[in-house]
C-alpha cells in the first residue's frame, strides 16, 4: 500500500477579522494509526493549535467526526479570527507509539492571512490656536488594519490637500498595521466654518472609506479690528464714544475703556452678533461727561481677545472753553481733525 500523504490543498487562506477560518487537511491512508495535530509555525518553537488526542482548544472545531474509524478528513475551523492568528499552519500526522506518539508526516502548510478593518481615523489639530496666514499641522491616525496596503487623503472643505506626509507602521511583516499622517494647512480669515477631513481607503472597506474630521473653529483665532468713533452730542455736557470690535473669533473677549490712561470701565463681550463667516462683531460705548474735564481727553478702547496681549485704539476728545451758551461752559468738538487713532 502507498505511504500516507498529508494533503493541505490550500496554500493560503484569507479571512476577515471576526470570521471563522477553515484550514483543510486530508490523509491519503488510514495507516499508520495515530492522531493528527495542528501547529502554527515550524521548528522547535511551533505552537500547538489543535491536538486530536488531548487538550482544550475552545476556538477550534473539527469539520468532520475524528472519532470515526475511517475518517481521513482532519480539517479544522478556528473561530473569531484576529490579526494575531496570521501565520503558517501545519497539519501533522503522528504514529501511535509508546510512551509517546512519533511525528510521521507533515502537510505542506497553509498560510492564514487576516483582513482587518482600520479603526475610525482620529484627526487632531495643534494644541494652541493660530491666526490667519499661519500654517498649522493636523495629524490623522488609524490602527489595526491588515493587509498593509492603504490609501490616505486629506481634504479641506472638499478640496484635496497635497502638503502631507504619511507613514505606515511597522515597515516589516506584522499581524496588523497603523497609519500616521501629518498635513499642513494655511489658515484664512474665512476658516471658522472650515473642516479638515482625513479619508482612509482599505480593501476591507469595500469602497466606502472611513473619515475623520476636525473643525478649524477649534484651531483658528481671528483677531478683532477696532474702530473708535465719537457720536453726536447727546446732551450739552455728554459725549457718546463707541468702540466697534469687528470680525473676531472665538467669542472670548474683554474690553476696557481708559480715560487719559485711567481705567474707566471693563466689560466682557456678551451679546455679540455673528457674521456669515462665523466671526463675531460687538460694540461698546462710553458716555463721557465733558464738564468733568478741564483739558482734552484721550479715550482708549483696549481689547484682550482670547487671552492674547491687548490691542487698543485711541480717540482724542477736545474739551475747549466757549462763551456761555444755553448754560453750557464746555463743549465736545466732533470734527475729523480732532480724531486720532493710536495703535
Amino acid at each position: 500500500e502507498e505511504e500516507l500523504q498529508v494533503i493541505q490543498p490550500d496554500k493560503s487562506v484569507l479571512v476577515a477579522a471576526g470570521e471563522t477560518a477553515t484550514l483543510r487537511c486530508t490523509a491519503t491512508s488510514l495507516i499508520p494509526v495515530g492522531p493528527i495535530q495542528w501547529f502554527r509555525g515550524a521548528g522547535p518553537g511551533r505552537e500547538l493549535i489543535y491536538n486530536q488526542k488531548e487538550g482544550h482548544f475552545p476556538r477550534v472545531t473539527t469539520v468532520s467526526d475524528l472519532t470515526k474509524r475511517n475518517n481521513m478528513d482532519f480539517s479544522i475551523r478556528i473561530g473569531n479570527i484576529t490579526p494575531a492568528d496570521a501565520g503558517t499552519y501545519y497539519c501533522v500526522k503522528f504514529r501511535k507509539g509508546s510512551p509517546d506518539d512519533v511525528e510521521f508526516k507533515s502537510g505542506a502548510g497553509t498560510e492564514l492571512s487576516v483582513r482587518a478593518k482600520p479603526s475610525a481615523p482620529v484627526v487632531s489639530g495643534p494644541a494652541a490656536r493660530a491666526t490667519p496666514q499661519h500654517t498649522v499641522s493636523f495629524t490623522c491616525e488609524s490602527h489595526g488594519f491588515s493587509p498593509r496596503d492603504i490609501t490616505l487623503k486629506w481634504f479641506k472643505n472638499g478640496n484635496e490637500l497635497s502638503d502631507f506626509q504619511t507613514n505606515v507602521d511597522p515597515v516589516g511583516e506584522s499581524v496588523s498595521y497603523s497609519i500616521h499622517s501629518t498635513a499642513k494647512v494655511v489658515l484664512t480669515r474665512e476658516d471658522v466654518h472650515s473642516q479638515v477631513i482625513c479619508e482612509v481607503a482599505h480593501v476591507t472597506l469595500q469602497g466606502d472609506p472611513l473619515r475623520g474630521t476636525a473643525n478649524l473653529s477649534e484651531t483658528i483665532r481671528v483677531p478683532p479690528t477696532l474702530e473708535v468713533t465719537q457720536q453726536p452730542v447727546r446732551a450739552e455736557n455728554q459725549v457718546n464714544v463707541t468702540c466697534q470690535v469687528r470680525k473676531f473669533y472665538p467669542q472670548r473677549l474683554q474690553l476696557t475703556w481708559l480715560e487719559n490712561g485711567n481705567v474707566s470701565r471693563t466689560e466682557t463681550a456678551s451679546t455679540v452678533t455673528e457674521n456669515k463667516d462665523g466671526t463675531y462683531n460687538w460694540m461698546s460705548w462710553l458716555l463721557v461727561n465733558v464738564s468733568a474735564h478741564r483739558d482734552d481727553v484721550k479715550l482708549t478702547c483696549q481689547v484682550e481677545h482670547d487671552g492674547q496681549p491687548a490691542v487698543s485704539k485711541s480717540h482724542d476728545l477736545k474739551v475747549s472753553a466757549h462763551p456761555k451758551e444755553q448754560g453750557s461752559n464746555t463743549a465736545a468738538e466732533n470734527t475729523g481733525s480732532n480724531e486720532r487713532n493710536i495703535y
Epitope: 521548528g43 522547535p44 518553537g45 505552537e47 500547538l48 487538550g55 511597522p170
Partner: antibody
Framework: DVQLVESGGGLVRPGESLRLSCAAS????????VTWVRQAPGEGLEWVSL???????YYADSVKGRFTISRDNSKSTLYLQMNGLRAEDTAVYYC???????????WGLGTLVTVSS | EIVLTQSPGTLSVSPGERATFSCRAS??????LAWYQQKPGQAPRLLIY???TRATGIPARFSGSGSGTEFTLTISSLQSEDFAVYYC??????????FGGGTKVEIK
C-alpha cells in the same frame, strides 16, 4: 498576564546537581515550547535548552549530556535537571516562553546558580 | 553554529539623539533575526523579530532592518529608559539559538 517564575537556584560544589523549576501562568502552557537561557555574571546571553510542545528536547553543546529539560503540562511547570555542574555553569538562569516564530517573548526574572568549591 | 557579532561594544549617546548599532551573522539567517533589550538586574525584553517586526507594546522609535548577514537596530530618539544592553539573536527554525555579545548604550 503571562508570568514565569524560576526557583531552585543556589550555591553548589563542582560535580554536584541542581534542579531548577519554572512555574508558568497566564497562557496555555501545553500549547507552547519553553526554553532556558543563562547569563554568566557580567556576560551576555547563552541559550541552554528548549522543549517543544510535543516534548522534543534540544540542547546547547556546552550542556549536552549533563542537563535534562522536561515539562509537566499538568502543573504548567518547566524543569532543568543539572548534573555534573562546573564553575563555568555559574549564571542567572532564565526560563522563557517561545513563540511560533522561535523567539522568546516572555521571560522570568531568573534564578542564580553558583558553582564554586 | 551561527556566530553573531555585534558592534560597537559600547555606544555613548545623548538623550534625544539617534542610536544605530549592528549585528553581523557568520552565515545567512534570512530575515530570522531578533533584538532584545536588557536593563541592569532585569530579564531581557523582546523588541524586534523577523529583522524588522516590532513585538507587542514596543514603541515606534525602535526599528530593525537588514537581511542575510547584516542587520541594524535603530532608536530614532533615545529616551532615558532606553539606556541598556541590546542583544541580537538568530531565530532560524533550528537550535542552537545563538545571541550576539551585546551592545551597551550609555549616556554621553
Amino acid at each position: 498576564d503571562v508570568q514565569l517564575v524560576e526557583s531552585g537556584g543556589g550555591l553548589v560544589r563542582p560535580g554536584e546537581s541542581l534542579r531548577l523549576s519554572c512555574a508558568a501562568s497566564g497562557f496555555t502552557f501545553t500549547n507552547y515550547a519553553v526554553t532556558w537561557v543563562r547569563q554568566a555574571p557580567g556576560e551576555g546571553l547563552e541559550w541552554v535548552s528548549l522543549i517543544s510542545v510535543t516534548g522534543t528536547t534540544y540542547y546547547a553543546d556546552s550542556v549536552k549530556g549533563r542537563f535534562t529539560i522536561s515539562r509537566d503540562n499538568s502543573k504548567s511547570t518547566l524543569y532543568l535537571q543539572m548534573n555534573g555542574l562546573r564553575a563555568e555553569d555559574t549564571a542567572v538562569y532564565y526560563c522563557a516562553k517561545v513563540t511560533w516564530k522561535n523567539v522568546f517573548d516572555y521571560w522570568g526574572l531568573g534564578t542564580l546558580v553558583t558553582v564554586s568549591s | 553554529e551561527i556566530v553573531l557579532t555585534q558592534s560597537p561594544g559600547t555606544l555613548s549617546v545623548s538623550p534625544g539623539e539617534r542610536a544605530t548599532f549592528s549585528c553581523r551573522a557568520s552565515q545567512t539567517v534570512g530575515s530570522k533575526l531578533a533584538w532584545y533589550q536588557q536593563k541592569p538586574g532585569q530579564a531581557p525584553r523582546l523588541l524586534i523579530y523577523d529583522a524588522n517586526t516590532r513585538a507587542t507594546g514596543i514603541p515606534a522609535r525602535f526599528s530593525g532592518s537588514g537581511s542575510g548577514t547584516e542587520f541594524t537596530l535603530t532608536i530614532s530618539s533615545l529616551q532615558s529608559e532606553d539606556f541598556a544592553v541590546y542583544y541580537c539573536q538568530q531565530h532560524t527554525d533550528w537550535p542552537p539559538y545563538t545571541f550576539g555579545g551585546g551592545t551597551k548604550v550609555e549616556i554621553k
